[in-house]
Interface confidence: low
C-alpha cells in the first residue's frame, strides 16, 4: 500500500490574505475585517494597525499588508514605522519637556524638529564670519585674508548639519 502520500501541512496552501481555520477543517478563510496576513500558511490573521488620534492613515490596511501611519499636521514621526508622533516646533526652536523653546544665542535649528545646534565656528577653519547666524540659520563663513587672491572662492558655506536619520521637512 502507498505510504509516500504527502504529509505536508494543509495550512501551507493558504495564501497571504487568508488564515488556516482550524474551526473549519483547516480550510483557508479570508482574513476578517481589520486584519491581515502578510505570508502564507498562517493560522491567524494579525490585527491591522489603527491610525487614530495624532496618527493618520498613510496607507490603508489590506488583507496582505498592515496599515501605515504618519502624523497629523503639526507633528512628525519618530521611531521605526512611525511608532510615535512628536510635536513640531518652529524653525529657531527646539522641543523641551516644557514645550517649544527658542534656541539659545549661539545655536540654531533650521527644521521643525530636532534640537538647536551650535553655529559653525568659522575661526576653526581659519575663516571669518561673513553672515551672522540667527536662531533659524547657521553663520556663513567667509574667506580668510589669505584667500583674497585672484581666482579664490569668495564664500564657503558650511556643510549642512543634519540630525542623523532625519530629512528636512
Amino acid at each position: 500500500f502507498e505510504r509516500t502520500r504527502s504529509l505536508q501541512d494543509p495550512c501551507s496552501n493558504c495564501p497571504a490574505g487568508t488564515f488556516c481555520d482550524n474551526n473549519r477543517n483547516q480550510i483557508c478563510s479570508p482574513c476578517p475585517p481589520n486584519s491581515f496576513s502578510s505570508a502564507g500558511g498562517q493560522r491567524t490573521c494579525d490585527i491591522c494597525r489603527q491610525c487614530k488620534g495624532v496618527f493618520r492613515t498613510r496607507k490603508e490596511c489590506s488583507s496582505t499588508s498592515n496599515a501605515e501611519c504618519d502624523c497629523t499636521p503639526g507633528f512628525h514621526c519618530l521611531g521605526a514605522g512611525c511608532s510615535m508622533c512628536e510635536q513640531d516646533c518652529k524653525q529657531g526652536q527646539e522641543l523641551t519637556k516644557k514645550g517649544c523653546k527658542d534656541c539659545c544665542f549661539g545655536t540654531f535649528n533650521d527644521q521643525k524638529r530636532g534640537i538647536c545646534r551650535p553655529w559653525t565656528n568659522c575661526s576653526l577653519d581659519g575663516k571669518s564670519v561673513l553672515v551672522n547666524g540667527t536662531k533659524e540659520r547657521d553663520v556663513v563663513c567667509g574667506p580668510s585674508p589669505a584667500d583674497l587672491s585672484p581666482g579664490a572662492s569668495s564664500v564657503t558655506p558650511p556643510a549642512p548639519a543634519r540630525e542623523p536619520g532625519h530629512s528636512p521637512q
Partner: antibody
Framework: EVQLVQSGAEVKKPGASVKVSCKAS????????THWVRQAPGQGLEWMGI????????SYAQKFQGRVTMTRDTSTSTVYMELSSLRSEDTAVYYC?????????????WGQGTMVTVSS | QSALTQPASVSGSPGQSITISCTGT?????????VSWYQQHPGKAPKLMIY???NRPSGVSNRFSGSKSGNTASLTISGLQAEDEADYYC???????????FGGGTKLTVL
Amino acid sequence: EVQLVQSGAEVKKPGASVKVSCKASGYTFTSYYTHWVRQAPGQGLEWMGIINPSGGSTSYAQKFQGRVTMTRDTSTSTVYMELSSLRSEDTAVYYCARGAPEYSSSSDYWGQGTMVTVSS
Amino acid sequence: QSALTQPASVSGSPGQSITISCTGTSSDVGGYNYVSWYQQHPGKAPKLMIYDVSNRPSGVSNRFSGSKSGNTASLTISGLQAEDEADYYCSSYTSSSTRWVFGGGTKLTVL
C-alpha cells in the same frame, strides 16, 4: 427561514445623509457577517463594506472611506448603513446581504433592497 | 470601470450551453479560490449561484457550474432554459483594502 428586511425608499438632497436599516431573522445574527452592496440604475453591483455583528468591526471599500458608517444593534438583530455627503451619483438601490458562514467568500441571503434617490 | 471584467452580453438557444468569463488579476481571482457568481432578474435582489469557484448552494440546479484557470473564472450554464435569462455577476475576494470586488455583469439572453 432566513430573512433580511430593509427599510423603505428614501429621497435626499445633495449633501445630506441617509441611514438604511437591515433587520435579520431566522439565524443567529452575531454568527454571520453582513455585507452592503449598491446598484445604481442600469449599472452593476458595487461592494461598499462589511460589518461583523458580533464585535462591530468593519471594513469599507476604499471608495467610501470617510463617508460610510456601518453599525449594528444586537438587541434587535439590525445592521445599519449610513452614507453622508450624498451626491447625485449615490442614487442607487442599496442591498444588505448575509456573508455565507462566518467570513466566507459569498453572500447567500440578500435583503430586498432600499432605493435611495439623491436629487435637488 | 469594474475591477473584474465580464462580457457585456451572451446569448444561447434553449438546451444549449453557454460560458461567461470573469477576468481579474493575481490579487483577486488568480490569488484566491473565493469567486462567487450571482444571478439577478430585473427588479430583484441577486441570488447566489456558485461560491468558492465551483460550489453550488443547496437548491441551485446542477446545470450551473463554475471553474477557474489562472486569473479567469468561468460560469457554465448547460441545458439553457428561458428562466435562466438574467444578469450574471462574478465576485471575488481581493487582497486590496477593498476586500470584495464585482464584475461589471453579463446579460444572458435565451433566444
